[in-house]
């Protein structure tokens, strides 16, 4: 039975040509986490591999950080970046745990994070 | 297994720079966060910053953005920091740290900086 | 920033004895925390991650535990070869920040 839950920064925004962290945590559970997936629609992002470290798409090799911990940063922000972005926690012997995060990038100036985690 | 080489201690004059390398084997360089750590007997363990070799994006500490420049030459596996204008405030040990799997698994023997006036 | 505290400077403890290590966060940090061991002239060393997990080699009588802001290393049967200083580190978001570490002496 997979009991755990993930907690997600929720819905974010962010102004163009800034930055923003994409995080999730899985807790509840305690099942290990093999790999976490960032997925953006059905676009790859990043994966982090416990045991081979990160592998970031190409196409987003020249905007996207891993860190801080399991998270991504999405630099240099564009309207076409407003979307869903998924956390997709590979984990024993649980399975498949999702989490969702809505990011809405600005033109104006006012941008209003999520407070579940801190973000700089 | 991972394996961190750092460059040997260094006397320094007070305004110069220092730039001190830290070496990776064992592992793909490109894959992980590369972090330097600053450790003194009055402040600790403090964080500078982070490289990610595979596109050379950096995360700096505020109190260290004019202090220290994070560089990675992936040719050769090596992670470089280099600290300007170098005062008393700079003498440290300073700790090149790969973050694994959320931690800073395997650490570097340290470089020993003293600046001299 | 967030401050991570560690109240006690010093702990001195007998060989055989069980010694909690604690550190508290001036914010939510969930479970994203670490606990490293610096031996004396040695670099600082990881053994615990996500509060609770122990990296592999590390022997099972350190034990990590908490969440939120409240973390807590317990050694039990202390060995003379646990003699070091004792650091915790939040990677919930950057700057990445230690606590002040906790010295460890064996009686």
């Known amino acids: 039975m997979m009991t755990g839950t993930i907690e997600t920064t929720g819905n974010i925004s962010a102004e163009k040509g800034g930055s923003i962290i994409l995080q999730c945590h899985l807790s509840s559970t305690t099942a290990q986490v093999t790999q976490v997936n960032w997925e953006q629609q059905d676009q790859l992002l990043a994966i982090c591999n416990a045991d081979l470290g990160w592998h970031i798409s190409p196409s987003f090799k020249d905007r996207v950080a891993p860190g801080p911990g399991l998270g991504l940063t999405l630099q240099s922000l564009t309207v076409n970046d407003t979307g869903e972005y998924f956390c997709i926690y590979h984990t024993y012997p649980d399975g498949t745990y999702t989490g969702r995060i809505f990011l809405e990038v600005l033109e104006s100036s006012v941008a209003e994070h999520g407070a579940r985690f801190q973000i700089p | 297994q991972a394996y961190l080489q750092q460059s040997g201690a260094e006397l320094v004059r007070s305004g110069a720079s220092v730039k001190m390398s830290c070496k990776a084997s064992?592992?793909?360089?490109?894959?992980?966060?590369m972090h330097w750590v600053k450790q003194t007997p009055g402040q600790g363990l403090e964080w500078i910053g982070k490289?990610?070799?595979?596109?050379?994006?950096?995360d700096y500490n505020q109190r260290f953005r004019d202090k220290a420049t994070l560089t990675a030459d992936t040719s050769s596996s090596t992670a470089y920091m280099q600290i300007s204008n170098l005062t008393s405030e700079d003498s440290a040990v300073y700790f090149c740290?790969?973050?694994?799997?959320?931690?800073?698994?395997?650490w570097g023997q340290g470089t020993t900086l003293t600046v001299s006036s | 920033d967030i401050v991570m505290t560690q109240s006690q400077k010093f702990m001195s403890t007998s060989i055989g004895d069980r010694v909690s290590v604690t550190c508290k966060a001036s914010?939510?940090?969930?479970?994203?925390v670490a606990w490293y061991q610096q031996r004396p002239g040695q670099s600082p060393k990881a053994l615990i991650y996500?509060?609770?997990y122990r990296y592999s080699g590390v022997p099972d009588r350190f034990a990590g535990s908490g969440s939120g802001t409240d973390f807590t290393l317990t050694i039990s049967n202390v060995q003379s070869e646990d003699l070091a200083d004792y650091f915790c580190?939040?990677?919930?978001?950057?700057?990445?920040?230690f606590g002040g570490g906790t010295k460890l002496e064996i009686k």
């Open positions: 740290t790969r973050e694994g799997w959320l931690s800073l698994g395997y």
């Open positions: 064992g592992y793909t360089f490109t894959s992980y966060n």
């Open positions: 490289i990610f070799p595979g596109n050379g994006f950096t």
């Open positions: 914010q939510n940090v969930v479970t994203n």
């Open positions: 996500s509060a609770s």
């Open positions: 580190q939040q990677h919930n978001s950057y700057p990445y920040t």
